[in-house]
């Protein structure tokens, strides 16, 4: 499947080979189930598409950090 654009419901079987601009990312979820062949991150883009990515890649880690910061509520 081109660019691993199609994220299965629970597992990823291949990863995108293309970095996605962080501005195009809306959210992510981690796939850590032992039933899956590999750990993965599924990003959801602004246009609602899902993409499987390798959590070991720096751009993936940076993107998750960025999204985490966006969703953090300000401390009072």
């Amino acid at each position: 499947q081109p660019d691993a654009i199609n994220a299965p419901v629970t597992c990823c079987y291949n990863f995108t080979n293309r970095k996605i601009s962080v501005q195009r990312l809306a959210s992510y979820r981690r796939i850590t189930s032992s039933k899956c062949p590999k750990e993965a991150v599924i990003f959801k883009t602004i246009v609602a598409k899902e993409i499987c990515a390798d959590p070991k890649q720096k751009w993936v880690q940076d993107s998750m950090d960025h999204l985490d910061k966006q969703t953090q509520t300000p401390k009072t």
Epitope: Q1, P2, D3, I5, N6, A7, P8, V9, T16, R18, I20, S21, Q23, R24, L25, F43, T45, I46, V47, A48, K49, E50, I51
Partner: antibody, heavy 121, light 107 residues
Framework: QVQLVQSGAEVKKPGASVKVSCKAS????????LHWVRQAPGQGLEWMGW????????NYAQKFQGRVTMTRDTSISTAYMELSRLRSDDTAVYYC??????????????WGQGTLVTVSS | DIQMTQSPSSLSASVGDRVTITCQAS??????LNWYQQKPGKAPKLLIY???NLETGVPSRFSGSGSGTDFTFTISSLQPEDIATYYC?????????FGQGTRLEIK
């Protein structure tokens, strides 16, 4: 070569439903999103939503939520768009269109020939 | 929803003329914009993607430019086969929206 072949023209009465098919060939059906776009007579293009044939995920334009259902049958590489509670202003040519495989982008590199749906009492 | 406004809605030009169509977005869409050509009775055809990239197989007389809210589509030398309606389409966000179209005729 890539082809999207749609079902034939339909005439429906107000309140009825219509189901349009889009048969894909020449590429891996589960590898690309398929969108539905309609065009009323003499009017512009209107996006209705997409289906991800790989996992059956869908995303519908809010305007059509509750009235449209997009499905697929991977065994015959065919996508379907069903629109219910038809009104006269649903009279349009309905197109399926393949979305190039880029996660953050949406552009349509191949289109079906279109299916004219006429809603008339 | 992001509104896309094309101008003019129709235009008439002579073979060999340079033709320009503009598309304005209701908010900043960076370069997330595509252009399509639709001939009468046919499905649309992708010409330009990401504001300025020519789709494979499309003649080089077609070009696109712009970013943010203002975009331009140009035919450098109009050919008889270019008679069609042209649409811009944004994908900055859902829902995907199109301009209302520009109908191009030969004088």
């Amino acid at each position: 070569q890539v082809q999207l072949v749609q079902s034939g023209a339909e005439v429906k009465k107000p309140g009825a439903s219509v189901k349009v098919s889009c048969k894909a060939s020449g590429y891996t059906f589960t590898g690309y999103y398929l969108h539905w776009v309609r065009q009323a007579p003499g009017q512009g293009l209107e996006w209705m939503g997409w289906i991800n044939p790989y996992n059956d995920g869908t995303n519908y334009a809010q305007k059509f939520q509750g009235r449209v259902t997009m499905t697929r049958d991977t065994s015959i590489s065919t996508a379907y768009m069903e629109l219910s509670r038809l009104r006269s202003d649903d009279t349009a040519v309905y197109y399926c269109a393949r979305d190039i495989a880029a996660a953050g982008a949406v552009y349509f590199d191949y289109w079906g020939q279109g299916t004219l749906v006429t809603v008339s009492s | 929803d992001i509104q896309m406004t094309q101008s003019p809605s129709s235009l008439s030009a002579s073979v060999g003329d340079r033709v320009t169509i503009t598309c304005q977005a209701s908010q900043d869409i960076t370069t997330y914009l595509n252009w399509y050509q639709q001939k009468p009775g046919k499905a649309p055809k992708l010409l330009i993607y990401d504001a300025s990239n020519l789709e494979t197989g499309v003649p080089s007389r077609f070009s696109g430019s712009g970013s943010g809210t203002d975009f331009t589509f140009t035919i450098s030398s109009l050919q008889p086969e270019d008679i069609a309606t042209y649409y811009c389409q944004q994908y900055d966000n859902l829902p995907i929206t199109f301009g209302q179209g520009t109908r191009l005729e030969i004088k």
